[in-house]
């Protein structure tokens, strides 16, 4: 029969073994977790022309100086962008990207990588890396960007027109859309036999000016004039009736890479529009 | 399949000048920079060129700056080197080889076959 | 222009050895870098980017370490089909700077 000692012995010896098992472990869950760490991207588009964001999240450090970002583009052989030891560094910097990028500097030591791009161009779509180092490890995500012209459309009741026309305008749209009207009365219905679309070429040569004229139109009804193209889907809204006309406009980016459609309101204004006096609806 | 065909190697007094081509197949050619890589006969691997996936920024090894130009027909997916002024030094095999910026941080992950290049009187 | 150098220049090992390629940088270096093996009057292919991602379809017995300067290449079991001329790359300021080989031959 074992001795008190003995038992002891072997249950100090256990509970050695035990414990250096435990450090053991959490030293190599320490190490492990200085090679890696978590980077998240959001699949983006940009409006040519205009400022874009190219979203780019990853886990903390505690000291600006020990983070580094870098944005590279496939096909591109500078550098999209780099940020280290608490500042930009551009000697590496594409001239494509030249006076055109800005990380959220302030916005880094909590994790934000985004990159702000200026004056959107058409060439600037692509797949994109944000790599990051900390004092923890290294981590990086893809992102794939798409760029194009994308605009809210607005619905008017065409008072130049012979017959009850409705005209849907969006400003500036590229690749060229699809446009569809639809009514809330006459669901289904196609509308391709009583409207007519045009797309005019605008001054830069890139982007398009959408205009879709719908006839025939009847009162107490809503409208809906969708623009679409591999970027963006918009919808203008009117409702016609004998005492008013309401608008609703509504944009949202097409983000099938993301988890959360990426999906804005803009101008969801209801404008109260007296009619005009000699246009008669059916 | 991914692949990279050279052709348009051959002899060539100094002087003299030649085309090389790469036809590419397999993958989406028009996103991807690509590089020339020479190999001297029982020497080691020489950068010598690369063009962007746009085809808008080329470079050159110092070696060859100002008689070598490098180029890219995207509708046709091929690659060019127009080699002028040669010398008996720009004796090689000369690879093209694709450069994957995002995945492989420049890394080169296609390479072609290689077409042979020899100045020589 | 940052200069890569390798050691040794030749390697003679046994199948089944564990075998070590260096590779020097003569300035740090982001960690862009890239080991390729090149067999006689074939292609080179690539083996590892961004100084230890390991190539699709590329043996795990190979492996890479290093930053700053110094960077290693190692096969943790030689096999015949290893026995090759291995070369390091790295890439900064649109240029790409080979080292100039380790031949790996049959001891």
């Known amino acids: 029969m074992a001795s008190l000692g003995q038992i002891l012995f072997w249950s100090i010896i256990s509970i050695i073994i035990i414990l250096a098992g435990a450090i053991a472990l959490i030293i190599g869950f320490g190490i492990s977790g200085r090679h890696s760490i978590t980077v998240t991207t959001v699949a983006s588009a940009g409006n040519i022309g205009e400022d874009g964001i190219l979203s780019c999240t990853f886990e903390p450090d505690i000291k600006l100086s020990d983070i580094v970002i870098q944005w590279l583009k496939e096909g591109v052989l500078g550098l999209v962008h780099e940020f280290k030891e608490g500042k930009d560094e551009l000697s590496e910097q594409d001239e494509m990207f030249r006076g055109r990028t800005a990380v959220f500097a302030d916005q880094v030591i909590v994790g934000n990588a985004s990159l702000r791009l200026k004056n959107v161009q058409l060439t600037d779509a692509g797949t994109y890396k944000c790599y990051i180092i900390t004092s923890k490890g290294k981590g990086n995500a893809n992102l794939e960007y798409k760029t194009g012209a994308f605009s809210m459309p607005e619905v008017n009741v065409d008072y130049n027109a012979s017959s009850e026309t409705l005209r849907c305008e969006a400003p500036r749209w590229f690749p060229q859309p699809t446009v569809v009207w639809a009514s809330q009365v006459d669901q289904g219905a196609n509308f391709s036999e009583v409207s007519n679309t045009s797309f005019e070429l605008n001054s830069e040569n890139v982007t398009m000016k959408v205009v879709s004229v719908l006839y025939n139109v009847t009162i107490n009804n809503t409208y809906s004039c969708m623009i679409e193209n591999d970027i963006a889907k918009a919808t203008g809204d009117i409702k016609v009736t004998e005492s008013e006309i309401k608008r609703r406009s509504h944009l949202q980016l097409l983000n099938s890479k993301a988890s959360l459609c990426v999906s804005s309101f803009f101008a969801i204004s209801w404008a109260l529009l007296p009619l005009s006096p000699y246009l008669m609806l059916k | 399949e991914v692949q990279l065909l050279e052709s348009g190697g051959g002899l060539v007094q100094p002087g003299g000048s030649l085309r090389l081509s790469c036809a590419a197949s397999?993958?989406?050619?028009?996103?991807?920079?690509m590089n020339w890589v020479r190999q001297a006969p029982g020497k080691g691997l020489a950068w010598v060129s690369a063009i962007s996936g746009s085809g808008g920024s080329t470079y050159y090894a110092d070696s060859v700056k100002g008689r070598f130009t490098i180029s890219r027909d995207d509708s046709k997916n091929t690659l060019y080197l127009q080699m002028n002024s040669l010398r008996a030094e720009d004796t090689a095999v000369y690879y093209c080889?694709?450069?994957?910026?995002?995945?492989?941080?420049?890394?080169?992950?296609?390479w072609g076959q290689g077409t042979t290049v020899t100045v020589s009187s | 222009d940052i200069q890569m150098t390798q050691s040794p220049s030749t390697l003679s090992a046994s199948v089944g050895d564990r075998v070590t390629i260096t590779c020097r940088a003569s300035?740090?270096?982001?960690?862009?870098l890239a080991w390729y093996q090149q067999k006689p009057g074939k292609a080179p292919k690539l083996l590892i980017y961004e100084a230890s991602s390991l190539e699709s379809g590329v043996p795990s017995r190979f492996s890479g370490s290093g930053s700053g300067t110094e960077f290693t290449l190692t096969i943790s079991s030689l096999q015949p089909d290893d026995f090759a001329t291995y070369y390091c790359?790295?890439?900064?300021?649109?240029?790409?700077?080979f080292g100039q080989g380790t031949k790996v031959e049959i001891k």
């Open positions: 300035q740090s270096i982001s960690g862009w």
């Open positions: 790359q790295q890439y900064k300021s649109y240029s790409w700077t």
């Open positions: 397999g993958f989406t050619f028009s996103t991807y920079a």
């Open positions: 080889a694709k450069v994957d910026v995002v995945a492989r941080y420049y890394g080169m992950d296609v």
